[in-house]
């Protein structure tokens, strides 16, 4: 057992049909001594009486807010949260599998830039009774501070069926360095409490990993006389590091036509313009990428040929 | 060329050079970003490398004031990497496959290496780490480490020469 | 006491499908993992598939990944295996366990054959 | 996939004596993950051993689980009548969970 936040414990169990479960000791935070009665959640049924009362914790029946009373006077309140843990594996049973870019993956982050910004996000079917707590570190021997907002439900999808349900968290390093090539990751560990179920889910990943810029901004077309040519322009997005002379984007112009059945004619350029070949009911779409490092290409900006 | 002494580097050349190193690096093993190397226990492997650090000059004022501090890391990261990529964790089993873009990648280091510091003037280098893994698929696992450590330092190294060309060639 | 009685095992051709049920009783069974374990005759055990509480995570051995799929009704109480495009070697005796690889408690097994 | 072998085959032996049953993983079995099971013929399997050491629910002292990494043991200190049986191991660090072979245990 172990104190998650004041007044608040985590029972650790090995979760299986008839398991034995874990003996706890409750003491009642006061300097009263005796006439101590102890009751569960909203039953006034007497547990027990004394300083301390002693549970076996095995099934969520167990788990709840155990108080202790003297004489119809509330002294203290010990809430009791549950850890499953099935055949070694704890359970992840409040957050859906992302499965991008691998299996068990609970928690996407990303950055828009080597800031030490970055936002974490993850998907859950659970509409009630859940709560989140984020923390974060670079390194975690001795870790140098990463502070993290509230977690906040950011979109709500329909999935079949089912309801899900996003929640996103922005954290900030404390003391970025953006021009350093990072050596220590950092980790993202994300509290999950539904109702009386604890989970608890990590991430461990560079800047450099995550990064996803914003779309080029300001795209523009400009025709090139008696051709069917067009000078396509953009400029780097406001999100993006700078200096962009040490911080440099490369791009992605593309020209699809209006069937996703048609070729696409791509160029690539570490220039903010590029002269392509304008189709008729074709669009220019063009994306970025740090040019030194191959982490993610930003979404497509897009601009009709016409 | 960096001179000890302090005379500015070819920064174009450096900087063309230096992103031809990220190309290289990438399609040595482009998949690395697909595998959690962490995940392995890399303390005793890739903890030695030489990296950029805070402290290193390497960012755009610390260029401004005195780039011979940020190049002699850059420096000494090349001849560090340049070093692993000929030894026996690169040579021996399993074998590369002869277009590998390995081979490259290594004359690449030394290429650039010898722009920043020509014969005769010297720089403290890093002592390389014994490493020598005596499975095969522990070679094959901190090939991938060491590749993924070199992408992300020229990828440092190549944005300052490429603000070195922008900003401070003469 | 935990009972599991399995159920939908028999005679298929190869192709064919079948769907296997586990009807679970003395304990909550919404609350744990639920996995299928099967032997063929004569022949060692091999893990199937498992399925946590809640339905939300699934996994398979490769050799049923895409034939095969593990389900549960929580309100049943009930866990399914429905296998398709069977093959003469998933010719075995089907058991249904709790958890997620560790089988702490067992059904009694059904049999099912596949052949022409 | 991790392949789990055991050994020996096949175990003759008379009441009384000491069974010793090893299982070898091709790798690492982290955190000590893994399970032994008793079969008799006709019955499901039983568990016996897990986290390759602890004793299920409601079995005899008499059978004890050692080993970690890639090398384990089952131990039956005094045979009796009813242990003559199948006995496989299985690890679950990873999945695809795996099962060994088996070693019959068989009387003398």
């Known amino acids: 057992i172990w104190e998650l936040k004041k007044d608040v414990y985590v029972v650790e169990l090995d979760w299986y049909p008839d398991a034995p479960g874990e003996m706890v000791v409750l003491t009642c935070d006061t300097p009263e001594e005796d006439g101590i009665t102890w009751t569960l959640d909203q039953s006034s049924e007497v547990l027990g009486s004394g300083k301390t009362l002693t549970i076996q914790v095995k099934e969520f029946g167990d788990a709840g807010q155990y108080t202790c009373h003297k004489g119809g006077e509330v002294l203290s309140h010990s809430l009791l949260l549950l850890h499953k843990k099935e055949d070694g594996i704890w359970s992840t049973d409040i957050l859906k599998d992302q499965k991008e870019p691998k299996n068990k993956t609970f928690l996407r982050c990303e950055a828009k830039n080597y800031s030490g910004r970055f936002t974490c996000w993850w998907l859950t079917t659970i509409s009630t009774d859940l709560t989140f707590s984020v923390k974060s570190s670079r390194g975690s021997s001795d870790p140098q501070g990463v502070t993290c907002g509230a977690a906040t439900l950011s979109a709500e999808r329909v999935r079949g069926d089912n309801k899900e349900y996003e929640y996103s968290v922005e954290c900030q390093e404390d003391s970025a360095c953006p021009a350093a090539e990072e050596s220590l990751p950092i980790e993202v560990m994300v509290d999950a409490v539904h109702k009386l179920k604890y989970e608890n889910y990590t991430s461990s990943f560079f800047i450099r990993d995550i990064i996803k810029p914003d779309p080029p901004k300001n795209l523009q077309l400009k025709p090139l006389k008696n051709s069917r040519q067009v000078e396509v322009s953009w400029e780097y997005p406001d999100t993006w590091s700078t200096p962009h002379s040490y911080f440099s984007l490369t791009f992605c112009v593309q020209v699809q036509g209006k069937s996703k059945r048609e070729k696409k004619d791509r160029v690539f350029t570490d220039k903010t313009s590029a002269t392509v070949i304008c189709r008729k009911n074709a669009s220019i779409s063009v994306r970025a990428q740090d040019r030194y490092y191959s982490s993610s290409w930003s979404e497509w900006a897009s601009v009709p040929c016409s | 060329r960096a001179v000890p002494g302090g005379s500015s580097p070819a920064w174009t050349q450096c900087q063309q050079l230096s992103q031809k190193l990220c190309t290289l690096a990438w399609s040595a093993h482009p998949l690395v970003g697909h595998m959690d190397l962490r995940e392995e226990g890399d303390e005793e492997t890739t903890n030695d490398v030489p990296h950029i650090q805070c402290g290193d000059g390497c960012d755009p004022q610390g260029l401004r004031d005195n780039s011979q501090f940020c190049l002699q890391r850059i420096h000494q990261g090349l001849i560090f990497y340049e070093k692993l990529l000929g030894s026996d964790i690169f040579t021996g089993e399993p074998s590369l496959l002869p277009d590998s873009p390995v081979g490259q990648l290594h004359a690449s280091l030394l290429g650039l290496s010898q722009l920043l510091q020509p014969e005769g003037h010297h720089w403290e280098t890093q002592q390389i780490p014994s490493l020598s893994p005596s499975q095969p698929w522990q070679r094959l696992l901190l090939r991938f480490k060491i590749l993924r450590s070199l992408q992300a330092f020229v990828a440092v190294a190549a944005r300052v020469f490429a603000h070195g060309a922008a900003t401070l060639s003469p | 006491e935990v009972q599991l009685l399995e159920s939908g095992g028999g005679l298929v051709q190869p192709g064919g499908s079948l769907r296997l049920s586990c009807a679970a009783s003395?304990?909550?069974?919404?609350?744990?993992?639920m996995s299928w374990v099967r032997q063929a005759p004569g022949k060692g055990l091999e893990w199937v598939s498992s399925?946590?509480?809640?339905?939300?995570?699934?996994d398979y051995a490769d050799s049923v990944k895409g034939r095969f799929t593990i389900s549960r009704d929580n309100s049943k109480n009930t866990l399914y295996l429905q296998m398709n495009s069977l093959r003469a070697e998933d010719t075995a005796v089907y058991y249904c366990?709790?958890?997620?690889?560790?089988?702490?408690?067992w059904g009694q097994g059904t049999l099912v054959t596949v052949s022409s | 996939d991790i392949q789990m072998t055991q050994s020996p085959g096949t175990l003759s032996l008379s009441p009384g004596e000491r069974a010793t049953v090893s299982c070898r993983a091709s790798?690492?079995?982290?955190?000590?993950?893994l399970a032994w099971y008793q079969q008799k013929p006709g019955l499901a399997p039983r568990l016996l051993i897990y986290?390759?050491?602890n004793r299920a629910t409601g079995i005899p002292d008499r059978f004890s689980g050692s080993g970690s990494g890639t090398d384990f043991t089952l131990t039956i200190t005094r045979l009796e009548p009813e242990d003559f049986a199948v006995y496989y191991c299985?690890?679950?660090?990873?999945?695809?969970?795996?099962f060994g072979p088996g070693t019959k245990v068989d009387i003398k």
């Open positions: 003395g304990f909550t069974f919404s609350n744990y993992s």
């Open positions: 399925i946590r509480s809640s339905g939300g995570r699934t």
């Open positions: 366990a709790t958890g997620i690889a560790v089988a702490r408690y």
């Open positions: 986290d390759a050491s």
């Open positions: 299985q690890q679950y660090s990873t999945s695809p969970f795996t």
């Open positions: 790798q690492s079995v982290s955190s000590s993950y």
